[in-house]
């Protein structure tokens, strides 16, 4: 058993049929010694008496808020949550496996630049009685500070018969060094509590590996005289690290016909302009990637050819 | 062309070669299904590699103030990785494919380090750790880790030279 926060405790349980559970000692936070009784949750049924109580916790019915009273007055509370371990593996019932980029990916994180700011998100089908708390650090043995905000519900989607809820959190490394080569990964830890079930999820990454620039901005076409060619130009996204002479991007320019089956013409360039042939009904798209490190491409920025 | 005396490096040449190094490092070890090598307990193997750290002056401001600290750090790293790529980690079993980019990568590391420090000049270099894994599978894993680490190192070096070529070239 360990304390998650004041008066909230997590009981770690090996979860199998007829498991003996854990014996947990509760002590009433009071100078009183006599006449103390204990109840669980909203029930008025007294389960035990005395300042200290030993309870066997083996299932969710044994978890909840234990309250000690004296003469009708509440003295203190202890909330017990359960963390299940089945076949040596901690349960992951609360969050959905996003399966990208690999199986057992519950947290996904992205950064728009090298400033030390990043966003993580996760999915669940649970809509109520759900709380998250997020902690992060750079490295684990001698951790350096990363400050995370509160997790918020950022999207709701309908998936077949189910509703899916996306939560996200923004974090910022306290003393980020955008130009340095990271040697210690960022660690992100999410505590999830659904009713009386506790679970924790972690992710470990270097900012460089989660970089995904915003799409290029101000994408424009300039027709070239007496030609089917156009000059496409664009700019670095506002959110990208500066100076651009140091934090450089590379770009992919694509000409795509109306039909998905039509052949795509692609050009790669380090410049912020390119000359391409603009076919009728086609569109021109440009996306960006870090020039020197193959992290994710941005989403496409597009303009129609016409 | 040399830097040790405080003179300026051939920024444009260094830029071109460092960008080539980036391409080679990624072709030598592309992101295979996002293989997370940090899960493989690599503390003892890749912790000793020289990293370009915050105080090394490789940021735009530090380069403007005095690029020597940064260039010396990059040089140390290039020599370190060049030695690693020439060691039995890469020359031993399992043999690299004949068309493997590791050979080119090795040569380019040497080339860039010589651009930074021609014959006759000496910066102190970091000792290469004695890593000699006994099993071929350990060697393979170590190669992946070294290449992943090299990708991060050369990315920072390439940024330094690109910025230098754009802003510090005479």
């Amino acid at each position: 058993i360990w304390e998650l926060k004041k008066d909230v405790y997590v009981v770690e349980l090996d979860w199998y049929p007829d498991a003996p559970g854990e014996m947990v000692v509760l002590t009433c936070d009071t100078p009183e010694e006599d006449g103390i009784t204990w109840t669980l949750d909203q029930s008025s049924e007294v389960l035990g008496s005395g300042k200290t109580l030993t309870i066997q916790v083996k299932e969710f019915g044994d978890a909840g808020q234990y309250t000690c009273h004296k003469g009708g007055e509440v003295l203190s509370h202890s909330l017990l949550l359960l963390h299940k371990k089945e076949d040596g593996i901690w349960s992951t019932d609360i969050l959905k496996d996003q399966k990208e980029p690999k199986n057992k990916t519950f947290l996904r994180c992205e950064a728009k630049n090298y400033s030390g700011r990043f966003t993580c998100w996760w999915l669940t089908t649970i809509s109520t009685d759900l709380t998250f708390s997020v902690k992060s650090s750079r490295g684990s043995s001698d951790p350096q500070g990363v400050t995370c905000g509160a997790a918020t519900l950022s999207a709701e989607r309908v998936r077949g018969d189910n509703k899916e809820y996306e939560y996200s959190v923004e974090c910022q490394e306290d003393s980020a060094c955008p130009a340095a080569e990271e040697s210690l990964p960022i660690e992100v830890m999410v505590d999830a509590v659904h009713k009386l079930k506790y679970e924790n999820y972690t992710s470990s990454f270097f900012i460089r590996d989660i970089i995904k620039p915003d799409p290029p901005k101000n994408l424009q076409l300039k027709p070239l005289k007496n030609s089917r060619q156009v000059e496409v130009s664009w700019e670095y996204p506002d959110t990208w690290s500066t100076p651009h002479s140091y934090f450089s991007l590379t770009f992919c320019v694509q000409v795509q016909g109306k039909s998905k089956r039509e052949k795509k013409d692609r050009v790669f360039t380090d410049k912020t302009s390119a000359t391409v042939i603009c076919r009728k009904n086609a569109s021109i798209s440009v996306r960006a990637q870090d020039r020197y490190y193959s992290s994710s491409w941005s989403e496409w920025a597009s303009v129609p050819c016409s | 062309r040399a830097v040790p005396g405080g003179s300026s490096p051939a920024w444009t040449q260094c830029q071109q070669l460092s960008q080539k190094l980036c391409t080679l490092a990624w072709s030598a070890h592309p992101l295979v299904g996002h293989m997370d090598l940090r899960e493989e307990g690599d503390e003892e193997t890749t912790n000793d590699v020289p990293h370009i750290q915050c105080g090394d002056g490789c940021d735009p401001q530090g380069l403007r103030d005095n690029s020597q600290f940064c260039l010396q750090r990059i040089h140390q790293g290039l020599i370190f990785y060049e030695k690693l790529l020439g060691s039995d980690i890469f020359t031993g079993e399992p043999s690299l494919l004949p068309d493997s980019p590791v050979g080119q990568l090795h040569a380019s590391l040497l080339g860039l380090s010589q651009l930074l420090q021609p014959e006759g000049h000496h910066w102190e270099t970091q000792q290469i750790p004695s890593l000699s894994p006994s099993q071929p599978w350990q060697r393979l894993l170590l190669r992946f880790k070294i290449l992943r680490s090299l990708q991060a190192f050369v990315a920072v070096a390439a940024r330094v030279f690109a910025h230098g070529a754009a802003t510090l070239s005479p």
Epitope: V46, L47, G48, I55, V57, E59, G61, D62 | -
Partner: nanobody, 114 residues
Amino acid sequence: EVQLVESGGGLVQPGGSLRLSCAASGFTFSSSVMFWLRQAPGKGLEWLSTIKPTGSTIYPGSGKGRFTISRDNAKNTLYLQINNLKPEDTALYYCARDIGGTVRGQGTQVTVSS
């Protein structure tokens, strides 16, 4: 009508063991929280242990010590195992449906003496 009938008490030497039983009827035993209490001569009721329908147990203090409560829902029976009996364990032992003993049996006498 609720009925609780304790048995298994008797005269035991110090250091000995006893297993008390309580046969329950007249209510849904399998979904009830059950208690063992005792009353020593000239003293008030003392709570010994609690067991929930699922078999999860609750004891006073920081450990179950010498007392072990258990139940068999199929037999509608509650048990109390007492080990290493001491003279101060001499008392009337009751099973009850509440910690105050408002619904309890007639009790079974345990006497610990050499």
